[in-house]
């Protein structure tokens, strides 16, 4: 058993049929010595008396808010949550496996630049009685500070018969050094509580591996005289790290016909312009990627050819 | 060429070669996170590789003030990785084909280090740890770790040379 926060405790249980459970001793936070009784949740049934209560925690019915009283007055509370371990593996019932980039990916994180700011998100089908708390650091043995905000519900989607809820959190490294080569990964830890079930999820990454620039901005076409060619130009996204002579991007320019089956013409360039042939009813799209480190491409910025 | 005394390197040549190094490093190990190398056994670790750290003056301001600190750090790293890529970590099993980018990577690391330091001038180099794994799986794991680490190192070096070529070239 360990303390998650004041008066909230997590009991770690091996979860299998007829498991013996864990013996837990609760102590009433009071100077009083006698006349103390214990109850669980809203029930008035007295579970025991005395300053300590010993219970055998085996299942969710044994978890909940234990309260010690004296003469009708509440002295203190202890909320017991359960953390299940099945076949040596901690349960992951609360969050959905996003399966990208690999199986057992519950948390996904992205950064728009090298400033040390990043966003993580996760999915669940649970809509009520759900709380999250997020902590982060750079490295684990001698951790350096990363400050995370509160997790918020950022999107709701309907997936078949189910509703899916996306939560996200923003974090910022306290003393970021954008130009340095990271040697210690960022660690993100999410505590999830659904009713009386506790679970924790972790992710470990370098900012460089989660970089995904915003799409290029101000995408424009300039027709070239007496030609089907156009000059496409664009700019670095505002959110990208500066100076651009140091934090450079590379770009992919694509000409795509109306039909998805039509052949795509692609050009790669380090410049912020390119000359392409604009076909009728086609569109021109540009996306960006860090020039020197192959992290994710941005989403496409697009304009119609006409 | 950068010399310990402090003259400027051939920024544009260094920029071109460092960008080529980035491409080769990703060809040699294109898989991002196909296996979480930080979770794997670390008995023979690569934590001793020289990293370009915050105080090494490789940021735009540090380069403007005095690029020598940064260039020395980059040179140190290039020599370190060049030695690793020439070691039996990369020559033993699993077998690399003769068209492997590792060979070109090895040659390009040497080429860039020579651009930074002509013969006759000597910057201090870091001791390379004696890593000689006997098992193919240990060797492969080290290969992957070294290449992932090299990708990060050459990305910073390439930024330094690109910025230098754009702002510090005579």
């Amino acid at each position: 058993i360990w303390e998650l926060k004041k008066d909230v405790y997590v009991v770690e249980l091996d979860w299998y049929p007829d498991a013996p459970g864990e013996m837990v001793v609760l102590t009433c936070d009071t100077p009083e010595e006698d006349g103390i009784t214990w109850t669980l949740d809203q029930s008035s049934e007295v579970l025991g008396s005395g300053k300590t209560l010993t219970i055998q925690v085996k299942e969710f019915g044994d978890a909940g808010q234990y309260t010690c009283h004296k003469g009708g007055e509440v002295l203190s509370h202890s909320l017991l949550l359960l953390h299940k371990k099945e076949d040596g593996i901690w349960s992951t019932d609360i969050l959905k496996d996003q399966k990208e980039p690999k199986n057992k990916t519950f948390l996904r994180c992205e950064a728009k630049n090298y400033s040390g700011r990043f966003t993580c998100w996760w999915l669940t089908t649970i809509s009520t009685d759900l709380t999250f708390s997020v902590k982060s650091s750079r490295g684990s043995s001698d951790p350096q500070g990363v400050t995370c905000g509160a997790a918020t519900l950022s999107a709701e989607r309907v997936r078949g018969d189910n509703k899916e809820y996306e939560y996200s959190v923003e974090c910022q490294e306290d003393s970021a050094c954008p130009a340095a080569e990271e040697s210690l990964p960022i660690e993100v830890m999410v505590d999830a509580v659904h009713k009386l079930k506790y679970e924790n999820y972790t992710s470990s990454f370098f900012i460089r591996d989660i970089i995904k620039p915003d799409p290029p901005k101000n995408l424009q076409l300039k027709p070239l005289k007496n030609s089907r060619q156009v000059e496409v130009s664009w700019e670095y996204p505002d959110t990208w790290s500066t100076p651009h002579s140091y934090f450079s991007l590379t770009f992919c320019v694509q000409v795509q016909g109306k039909s998805k089956r039509e052949k795509k013409d692609r050009v790669f360039t380090d410049k912020t312009s390119a000359t392409v042939i604009c076909r009728k009813n086609a569109s021109i799209s540009v996306r960006a990627q860090d020039r020197y480190y192959s992290s994710s491409w941005s989403e496409w910025a697009s304009v119609p050819c006409s | 060429r950068a010399v310990p005394g402090g003259s400027s390197p051939a920024w544009t040549q260094c920029q071109q070669l460092s960008q080529k190094l980035c491409t080769l490093a990703w060809s040699a190990h294109p898989l991002v996170g196909h296996m979480d190398l930080r979770e794997e056994g670390d008995e023979e670790t690569t934590n001793d590789v020289p990293h370009i750290q915050c105080g090494d003056g490789c940021d735009p301001q540090g380069l403007r003030d005095n690029s020598q600190f940064c260039l020395q750090r980059i040179h140190q790293g290039l020599i370190f990785y060049e030695k690793l890529l020439g070691s039996d970590i990369f020559t033993g099993e699993p077998s690399l084909l003769p068209d492997s980018p590792v060979g070109q990577l090895h040659a390009s690391l040497l080429g860039l280090s020579q651009l930074l330091q002509p013969e006759g001038h000597h910057w201090e180099t870091q001791q390379i740890p004696s890593l000689s794994p006997s098992q193919p799986w240990q060797r492969l794991l080290l290969r992957f770790k070294i290449l992932r680490s090299l990708q990060a190192f050459v990305a910073v070096a390439a930024r330094v040379f690109a910025h230098g070529a754009a702002t510090l070239s005579p």
Partner: antibody, heavy 120, light 107 residues
Framework: QVQLVQSGAEVKKPGSSVKVSCKAS????????IHWMRQAPGQGLEWIGY????????KYNENFKGKVTITADKSTSTAYMELSSLRSEDTAVYYC?????????????WGQGTLVTVSS | DIQMTQSPSSLSASVGDRVTITCKAS??????VAWYQQKPGKVPKLLIY???TRHTGVPSRFSGSGSRTDFTLTISSLQPEDVADYFC?????????FGSGTKLEIK
């Protein structure tokens, strides 16, 4: 895009020789090794060897040494595999293939295969 | 030479079934193992490399696992188009060798 086009099926007498070609396009021919594999009817695959056109150096599976000669013609971007002293057990589909760019023998692109039948 | 012992040599399963094919290397090959699919009359097609990495465009129902000497290819939910021969391949050591193949059919 990368393409490997092999020569047509051959029927040969025991004791004779056969030369199978593999014309490559869509990449720089001298940049990558070209490998040869064979698959006897209803059997698995066997790796025969490769040639690195940049320096014309072949490497063979010991089991095929003296049996096989692999060559390359840079001017036509074509690799060849010659089998000598043919026996009925050399009847198989012969494939050329090139690996991905990471330097390991991961065969991404394959020729369509050439059936060599050895029969008297 | 490294022997790749593949089993079973053939198997028949129903659409939707979970199918597992195994390969045992005669010595340590790290994770230098690939799996190929060969449909009747076609050339082999790379499915999995580095023991567990799916090649571009390969459906997520295909997965690989294992290291050193024991390797597995799993199809989580068999589809009619998965009827084919499957081969494992070690690319750790010369000469590169293949398993003898598994013929997969639909019941």
């Amino acid at each position: 895009q990368v393409q490997l086009v092999q020569s047509g099926a051959e029927v040969k007498k025991p004791g004779s020789s056969v030369k199978v070609s593999c014309k490559a396009s869509g990449y720089t021919f001298t940049d990558q090794t070209i490998h040869w594999m064979r698959q006897a009817p209803g059997q698995g695959l066997e790796w025969i060897g490769y040639i690195y056109p940049r320096d014309d150096s072949p490497k063979y599976n010991e089991n095929f040494k003296g049996k096989v000669t692999i060559t390359a013609d840079k001017s036509t971007s074509t690799a060849y595999m010659e089998l000598s002293s043919l026996r009925s057990e050399d009847t198989a589909v012969y494939y050329c293939a090139i690996p991905d760019r990471s330097g390991y023998a991961l065969f991404i692109y394959w020729g369509q295969g050439t059936l060599v039948t050895v029969s008297s | 030479d490294i022997q790749m012992t593949q089993s079973p040599s053939s198997l028949s399963a129903s659409v939707g079934d979970r199918v597992t094919i195994t390969c045992k290397a005669s010595r340590d090959v790290a994770i230098a193992v690939a799996w190929y699919q060969q449909k009747p009359g076609k050339v082999p097609k790379l499915l999995i490399y580095w023991a567990s990495t799916r090649h571009t465009g390969v459906p997520s129902r295909f997965s690989g696992s294992g290291s050193r000497t024991d390797f597995t290819l799993t199809i989580s939910s068999l589809q009619p188009e998965d009827v084919a021969d499957y081969f494992c391949h070690q690319y750790s050591s010369y000469p590169f060798t293949f398993g003898s193949g598994t013929k997969l059919e639909i019941k």
